[in-house]
């Protein structure tokens, strides 16, 4: 398990419900989320990085290895 | 506020097929992740499908595996399940519900009956 | 597959008891674990998350505990309302529901 800090949605929304998939970038406050394991189900979720849940959302997120990008780190970063 | 309107439901004989529609309204349907689940009557819960926000991430029931195809339409805001080579064990009512490990809002749900 | 065993499958209670019902998970499920309750013709509502986070708007009579396979719905004072179908659901892996357990009036 773990923490940190991300940016609520550009709608001031803190992405609290079971389920939401957060992609806001605008910042506005900043606030603690905490992150557990991944389900076993998200095994295969993120192509190029790694799965972490996000405990008030219930949902998981992924952190791409360098040189990938997008939700499931299914993209790749020409310019990197 | 949310509402899910599951609609497609009916009669139909083994082995047939059916298109399920859910469409979605009061929250930004392209950010959730929306699965169905069904319950046989006067049974219980089984959850029978799941899609992610972008439409990339599915999983299956290993009841419905190969036969039911999930899939949205984030323009139109909604959400459908195919289904093929129906069963009579898949008579139940269908239920659209918001998320992926837990659902938080659900439709009215939508009636299949497989009967000859 | 991990299968989901509440118990009791039925129950009677008076308005005022405290009720519990426990649910059992085949393999452990750390906390992934979501408690719901459906009324006859309706669908179900999301109540208790994550074993023990309460949902938005659920009255707090309503608690949730345990971890790994042993779970527990605790029902502090059962109001009228209350009588109806709950079911336990894992999402550790696949996701599946308990059996369901009915309150019913004694």
């Known amino acids: 398990d773990g923490n940190t800090t991300r940016t609520p949605e550009t709608n001031g929304s803190l992405c609290g419900a079971p389920g939401e998939n957060c992609t806001g970038t605008t910042p506005r406050q900043k606030v603690k989320t905490h992150f557990s394991r991944c389900p076993k189900q998200y095994k295969h979720y993120c192509i190029h990085g790694r799965c972490r849940f996000v405990v008030d959302e219930q949902t998981p997120s992924c952190i791409c290895e360098k040189g990938y990008f997008g939700a499931r780190c299914e993209r790749v970063d020409l310019f990197y | 506020q949310v509402q899910l309107l599951e609609s497609g439901g009916g009669l139909v004989q083994p082995g047939g097929s059916l298109r399920l529609s859910c469409a979605a309204s009061?929250?930004?349907?392209?950010?959730?992740?929306i699965s169905w689940v069904r319950q046989a009557p006067g049974k219980g819960l089984e959850w029978v499908s799941y899609?992610?926000?972008?439409?990339?991430?599915?999983n299956y029931a290993d009841s419905v595996k190969g036969r039911f195809t999930i899939s949205r339409d984030n323009s139109k805001n909604t959400l459908y399940l195919q289904m093929n080579s129906l069963r009579a064990e898949d008579t139940a009512v269908y239920y659209c519900?918001?998320?992926?490990?837990?659902?938080?809002?659900w439709g009215q749900g939508t009636l299949v009956t497989v009967s000859s | 597959d991990i299968q989901m065993t509440q118990s009791p499958s039925s129950l009677s209670a008076s308005v005022g008891d405290r009720v519990t019902i426990t649910c059992r998970a085949s393999?452990?499920?750390?906390?992934?674990l979501g408690w719901y309750q459906q009324k006859p013709g309706k669908a179900p509502k999301l109540l208790i998350y994550?074993?023990?986070s309460l949902q938005s708007g659920v009255p707090s009579r309503f608690s949730g505990s345990g971890s790994g396979t042993d779970f527990t719905l605790t029902i502090s004072s059962l109001q009228p309302e209350d009588f109806a179908t709950y079911y336990c659901?894992?999402?550790?892996?696949?996701?599946?529901f308990g059996q369901g357990t009915k309150v019913e009036i004694k």
């Open positions: 519900a918001r998320g992926g490990s837990l659902f938080d809002y």
């Open positions: 009061g929250f930004t349907f392209s950010r959730y992740w």
């Open positions: 899609i992610d926000s972008t439409g990339t991430f599915i």
């Open positions: 393999q452990g499920i750390i906390s992934y």
């Open positions: 994550a074993a023990s």
């Open positions: 659901q894992q999402y550790d892996a696949l996701n599946t």
